[in-house]
């Protein structure tokens, strides 16, 4: 059976697969997924290993028409480094010389300057090039190699291993060499995999059942540390409760060096955030932190300094803390917009069972703003999801130069932000450099400001506008309002009408359905339309909604189904990657973000068309 990293190298024109007959004879044969000699896998960014021989594909020299054979894997050798060139060409790195079969009656695979069909290779059974099954470095735990990555294949007691092994052990713990020759270098670490006993790598907090892994002997950059946690279905540590900080202070008290945690300000336009998307509501900075020096965008916990936090450059090499297990944030359920008949008094706007109102003209200090909202039967607004925030920005008449009080504050417990309406803090969206909580100005209250409506802490005594929110009152059967310029069942936003397609459809089917409605799969022109769409679909239970974006026509170039330029993107992390496909919007915790899916997957979708009676603005000229 093929494991997910293994593949057969297939030439479509010959309809044959590469076959390692022996280390000195790499040829082709009829494809057979059970033949070990046809299985290959990437063992570094640029090396391809034969699974049968645990040797790497290479050449004797970077010259035209030399045989490709198998060599002992050497990550430093220039003659073993391969790369995918445009589309399905496979070539030796840095040269226009390609992996080729079929010329001059040659039985062997050759390195050749020709880039025709016989130099084009795919993963057998797919339309993907070889790089789509690329190498993912596996960061080790414990051992003696400071958390370095596994080196596959590695030699132990004169035997080669292409995977983690329990050789030399009687307890089943899996390990790997971190250089290709363990026997000489004696460097190794344990693999971040599930095996009997691997739970002892974690400390479980008996109070919350959350588990923590302290990797104090590792030396990784912040991004490497995060990857290591993710390889164990975990994330870099987030701390949202005072109890959690206390537990970790105890857990790390015997250590002295800094440890990476998930706090960062890597997002270009927003402020401090946790990598696991937990709300940033508890602050425990070291005095003098966070320093405003550019580049210091990642945060370490300092065991030697009472486990307080310090921002550093992300490329520094430190130990790190991973966290996994049930988070307390899931217990607060926000009703989906479609579940709640929402009736509001005049001048209040409905959304997901609540009513909202911006008071822009009567400026008030935070305390007085709160009193006014409470007199009106509500509270200063709490915001629990990106969808709710995007509703406020896109549909309440929020303006880019607004600065408005919301209900978040740390008046009760310093450095621990809470909502004034008592609902749990499940989401935060701070402005770049926020929360700054400058001590010389007690900044205990929070405003929404700027074009994106992100948040900043502020002294509570400033007179500002504010946003109130109250529970809506149900009034018998809901009346479906037909929005001016849109048919029944369509929702209007600016110049367009939108409709959710409720049948699970492939991308092509969804596109056809929209066309049948004299509409098209939605385009997304800017941040504000994205905000509207996020609030429109983001709280729904389905995972994905098709948009009109895909790279079906030209692989690697994403285009809308209608002739409109792609001027705005909202990719999820690791997207679009190298995968070709069609683009759908996520819901839930990653609400609104774009993922590339296989176009024949089934999802719901959003159709869009010009509202009736709207004058089309002229197309922008460039």
């Amino acid at each position: 059976l093929l494991d997910t990293r293994q593949f057969l190298i297939y030439n479509e024109d010959h309809k044959r697969c590469v076959d390692a007959v022996s280390p000195s004879a790499v040829q082709t044969a009829a494809c057979n997924q059970d033949a070990e000699s046809q299985k290959f896998r990437w063992v570094s960014e640029s090396q391809i290993m034969s699974v049968a021989f645990k040797l790497c594909l290479g050449v004797p020299s970077k010259t035209d028409w030399v045989a490709i054979t198998l060599y002992a894997c050497d990550s430093k050798s220039e003659f073993q480094k391969w790369e995918c060139k445009n589309d399905t060409l496979l070539g030796i790195k840095g040269e226009d010389l390609f992996f080729n079969y079929g010329n001059r009656q040659e039985k062997n695979i050759m390195l050749y300057k020709g880039s025709g069909l016989w130099s084009r290779w795919k993963i057998y059974g797919t339309t993907d090039n070889l790089c789509s099954r690329g190498y993912e470095a596996m960061y080790t735990l414990l051992g003696n190699a400071n958390g370095a990555t596994c080196a596959f294949p590695f030699k132990f007691e004169n035997k080669w291993y292409a995977d983690c092994t329990s050789a030399g052990r009687s307890d089943g713990w899996l390990w790997c060499g971190t250089t290709t020759d363990y026997d000489t270098d004696k460097l190794f670490g344990y693999c971040p995999l599930k095996f009997e006993g691997s739970e002892s790598l974690w400390n479980k907090d008996p109070l919350t059942s959350v588990s923590y892994q302290i990797n104090s002997k590792s030396a990784l950059t912040w991004h490497q540390a995060r990857k290591s946690c993710q390889q164990q279905n975990a994330e870099l540590l987030s701390i949202t409760e005072i109890h959690e900080q206390t537990y970790l202070t105890g857990l790390t008290s015997s250590l002295t060096s800094g440890l990476w945690i998930g706090l960062n300000s890597l997002s270009f336009n927003s402020g401090w955030q946790w990598s696991d998307r937990s709300p940033f509501r508890y602050l425990n900075w070291l005095p003098g932190s966070p320093s405003a020096e550019p580049g210091k965008s990642c945060v370490s916990l300092n065991p030697g300094k009472n486990a307080k936090w310090e921002n550093l450059e992300c490329v520094q090499k430190l130990g790190y803390i991973c966290k996994k297990g049930n988070t307390t944030l899931n217990s607060f359920v926000i009703p989906s917009e479609s579940d709640v008949p929402t009736h509001c008094p005049s001048q209040w706007w409905p959304y997901a069972g609540h009513c909202y109102k911006i008071h822009r003209d009567e400026k008030k200090i935070q305390r007085d703003a709160l009193t006014t909202c409470r007199k009106e039967g509500g509270d200063l607004t709490s915001i629990h999801t990106i969808e709710e925030l995007d509703f406020i920005i896109s549909q309440l008449g929020y303006e880019p130069n607004d600065e408005l009080w919301i209900g978040l504050n740390d008046i009760k417990i310093q450095m621990y932000f809470e909502w004034s309406d008592g609902t749990p803090v499940t989401f935060t969206k701070w402005l770049r450099g926020e929360p700054s909580h400058e001590n010389n100005r007690q900044e205990d209250c929070v405003v929404m400001k700027g074009k994106d409506g992100y948040w900043a802490d502020r002294g509570c005594e400033w007179p500002l506008g504010y946003i109130c929110k109250m529970k809506s009152r149900s009034q018998g059967p809901e009346i479906v309002e037909v929005e001016k310029g849109c048919r029944k069942g369509w929702k209007k936003h600016h110049f367009y009408c939108y409709m959710i397609g409720h049948t699970l459809s492939t991308f092509a089917e969804a596109n056809q359905t929209c066309n049948n409605e004299n509409a098209y799969l939605t385009t997304i022109e800017d941040r504000y339309e994205q905000a509207f769409l996020t609030s429109f679909v983001g709280l729904r239970p389905e995972k994905y909604f098709w948009t009109g974006l895909s790279d079906i026509q030209t692989k690697g170039t994403f285009q809308w189904t209608i002739e409109e330029e792609v001027r705005f993107t909202h990719w999820n992390s690791d997207m679009p990657g190298r995968k070709p496909g069609c683009v759908a919007m996520r819901t839930g915790i990653a609400g609104g973000l774009w993922d590339v899916l296989k176009c024949d997957e089934k999802a719901k979708f959003v159709c869009k068309h010009w509202a009736e009676g709207v004058t089309h603005p002229p197309k922008p000229t460039t």
Epitope: G168, Y182, S200
Partner: nanobody, 110 residues
Framework: QLVQPGGSLRLSCAAS????????MGWYRQAPGKQREEVAA???????NYADSVKGRFTISRDNAKNTVYLQMNSLKPEDTAVYYC?????????????WGQGTLVTVSS
């Protein structure tokens, strides 16, 4: 160590060094001219296992804080005469897991 038949003896074994965790500890014995055999073992969670020949007479226990394993031997018989070895299955700074004590001779004789 010389013990009378029917007598008792307690063996102890401590593991030291750069140890992350001890997954299991156990006692083995080798009588003259015979193969080494497992007598008793205990996991990090406290589960125990005994050879049939010592069940009800020997008790293995462990002090995790001290990385130490004990073997309490009661109702000793002449056939218990052997060199007793302790083994620790550890996670440490080499990939090898099994570390052995140097052995202690127990003689049961009147």
């Amino acid at each position: 160590q010389l013990v009378q038949p029917g007598g008792s003896l307690r063996l102890s074994c401590a593991a030291s060094g750069s140890i992350f965790t001890i997954n299991a500890m156990g006692w083995y014995r080798q009588a003259p001219g015979k193969q080494r055999e497992e007598v008793a073992a205990i996991t990090s969670g406290g589960s125990t296992n005994y050879a049939d020949s010592v069940k009800g007479r020997f008790t293995i226990s462990r002090d995790n804080a001290k990385n130490t394993v004990y073997l309490q031997m009661n109702s000793l018989k002449p056939e218990d005469t052997a060199v007793y070895y302790c083994k620790a299955v550890v996670v440490t700074t080499t990939p090898y897991s099994d570390y052995w004590g140097q052995g202690t001779l127990v003689t049961v004789s009147s």
